[in-house]
């Protein structure tokens, strides 16, 4: 039986991507310059290490975490890298234009690269919900819209609520999750007969997904502490994140076994739940005063993640067309919300203890921030979904969802790849 390949992206992708890259190069040429004032080379190296951790998380961690599909593992890893590379470039420019452009030029520092990598990470989280159903040309659109939406969200939140870099970036979990879910909702859903096997996981790709999860697990403390201002804040953030992810691993493996009738451990549950603690403490990682509190949060997050992985995929598959192994969307949406709620609860508990009259106002501000993040994520996600449905992108045919052969040249065209 001959393979029904989709409409070629040969005419669409190179022209679109290279034109965009040329435009970015021109923007960098006219509007940016490096920060030339660094005197201390040792300090530069130390500062770069945080950025390096974030890049490892994005390229290897999220790249491999999404690679568990039987016939879509190459595309998952490589498309992630493509989106990261493009997203970082656009995020550096966008953040510069939004925050420092009035001074004439955008100054590129190690911090701006750090910030841009985190913004691009948002796309890598969202895309888990649509990988396998879109081509690279569509992913370029998704990168541009999402990075722009996140950048503007952060700017709006900062200006209205006077929040710092860390606080406004920690909405990334909720934002990315709801953005991805709303894009997935817009895309064609039903998988035609005969393609069900492609969105199943396979042993070797699942192992690489576990490798991705391990890299994320190792570097999550760097992510949560990357934008904090002082060593004491960063230290607390690193410690608390570490305790939380450590407990969520134990909870994930135990909870996964508990959730199975025969006591078996699910790979999918473990992939997602090991990260649960890091997401849940993200917003308040530097505010948590004691290890036990971070550990309790890790435990709760692990349980929620395993519970979500057990009961939500059916719903997500029916309503949004998201395959069972694409766990990041609903996982991060739940855990991101949990993290925001934890922040508000800490605020309330401590302010009540101190007898501060500003409590209602501060809680209102926090709820306002969260609501704004969700609303902008949903709106921009729906806009992106509508854009991705346009015929010009030559989207893969539904029969060719989750298929590496559509995009990659293999020396052997074995159908069972």
């Amino acid at each position: 039986m001959s393979s029904k390949y989709p409409r070629s992206v040969r005419r669409c992708l190179p022209l679109w991507a290279l034109t965009l890259e040329a435009a970015l190069i021109l923007l960098f040429y006219f509007f940016t310059h490096y920060d030339a004032s660094l005197e201390d080379q040792k300090g530069l190296v130390a500062s770069y290490q945080v950025g390096q951790d974030l890049t490892v998380m994005a390229a290897i961690g999220l790249g491999f975490l999404t690679s568990s599909f039987r016939r879509h593992s190459w595309s998952s890893v490589a498309f992630n890298l493509f989106m990261l590379a493009l997203g970082v470039q656009w995020a550096i420019l966008l953040d510069g234009f939004l925050s420092q452009f009035p001074s004439g030029k955008v100054v590129i520092t190690l911090f701006s690269i750090r910030l841009a990598t985190m913004s691009a990470l948002s796309v890598l989280i969202s895309v888990d919900a649509v990988l396998g159903k879109v081509n690279l040309a569509q992913l370029v659109v998704m990168v541009l819209v999402e990075v722009t939406a996140l950048g503007n969200l952060r700017m709006v939140i900062s200006n209205i609520f006077n929040t710092d870099y860390h606080m406004n970036m920690m909405h990334i979990y909720v934002f990315a999750a709801y953005f991805g879910l709303s894009v997935a909702w817009c895309l064609p859903k039903p998988l035609p007969e005969g393609t069900e096997d492609k969105d199943q996981t396979a042993t070797i790709p699942s192992l690489s997904a576990m490798l991705g999860a391990l890299f994320l697990w190792m570097f999550w403390p760097s992510f949560n502490s990357a934008l904090l201002r002082s060593p004491i804040e960063r230290k607390n953030a690193v410690f608390n994140t570490y305790y939380a992810v450590a407990v969520s691993v134990v909870t994930a493996i135990s909870g996964s076994s508990l959730a199975h009738p025969q006591g078996k451990i699910s790979k999918t549950y473990v992939h997602s739940a090991v990260l649960a603690g890091g997401v849940a403490v993200g917003t308040s990682c530097h505010l948590i005063p004691s290890p036990w509190l971070a550990m309790v949060l890790g435990l709760v997050a692990g349980l929620i993640s395993v519970g979500g992985a057990k009961y939500l995929p059916g719903c997500c598959n029916r309503v949004l067309g998201i395959p069972h192994s694409s766990i990041m969307g609903y996982n991060f949406s739940l855990l991101g919300l949990l993290g925001e709620i934890i922040y508000i609860v800490l605020l309330v508990l401590d302010t009540v203890g101190a007898g501060n009259g500003m409590i209602g106002f501060q809680v209102l501000l926090s709820i306002g921030e969260l609501s704004l993040a969700i609303v902008i994520a949903l709106m921009s996600g729906l806009l992106t979904g509508l854009l991705l449905n346009l015929k010009i992108w030559k989207a893969p045919h539904e029969a060719k969802y989750f298929d590496d052969q559509v995009f990659w040249k293999f020396p052997h065209l074995a159908v069972g790849f």
Epitope: D35, S37, L38, D40, G43, L44, A46, S47, V50, S99, T109, L110, F111, R114, S158, N159, N162, T163, D164, M167, N168, R229, S230, P231, I232, E233, N236, S284, H286, L287, I288, P289, L293, L346, L347, L349, D350, G353, A354, M358
Partner: antibody
Framework: QVQLVESGGGVVQPGRSLRLSCAAS????????MHWVRQAPGKGLEWVAV????????YYADSVKGRFTISRDNSKNTLYLQMNSLRAEDTAVYYC??????????????????????WGKGTTVTVSS | EIVMTQSPATLSVSPGERATLSCRAS??????LAWYQQKPGQAPRLLIY???TRATGIPARFSGSGSGTEFTLTISSLQSEDFAVYYC???????????FGQGTKLEIK
Amino acid sequence: QVQLVESGGGVVQPGRSLRLSCAASGFTFSSYGMHWVRQAPGKGLEWVAVIWYDGSNKYYADSVKGRFTISRDNSKNTLYLQMNSLRAEDTAVYYCARDMVTMVRGAYRNYYYYGMDVWGKGTTVTVSS
Amino acid sequence: EIVMTQSPATLSVSPGERATLSCRASQSVSSNLAWYQQKPGQAPRLLIYGASTRATGIPARFSGSGSGTEFTLTISSLQSEDFAVYYCQQYNNWPTLYTFGQGTKLEIK
């Protein structure tokens, strides 16, 4: 003891450049953000710039943005302010100050407060033709 | 940009009496406010941070209060060494800016 000593001030013509230095001693310089603050003759204090402890982030007052550059060398325990395109209104005593971040542990959460807790004696910059 | 307004510009108080200095922000700065004391020919000295926490070595007669847009520095019983210029200063997260008030000169009555 904890000390900050500014140097590099002087008389300079408008449009020219000057580089101020601030030598720190008595504390772990690489663990603190640092500020430059100025005070024009007979006037109040005006914040100029801040740099994070690791040099990764810098911010400037609108009045000096694009003309002044703050930097630091943690290996030499020194803070710098490169001032270009100087104007008459830049005439002031320039102080460097340490950025204090204090953590107050509440029952359920930490609070972080900021202030400039250690100041140098200042160095005078006069921009005049 | 947040503007800090201090009042009064000059305050005349007798030694031993209480002095109350006010600082108003044009928009909420939460508790991101500090108070400084500056004597002629000297560098400023941090008195209060976080709107109400005394800095190390600052006598108990200095106290700060307020949150949001209205802040107060109170000196309960003025000593001769307290006569100086006092500045309030806010820290804004975004854009990252530090703004000082124009100062209140505390003089002997």
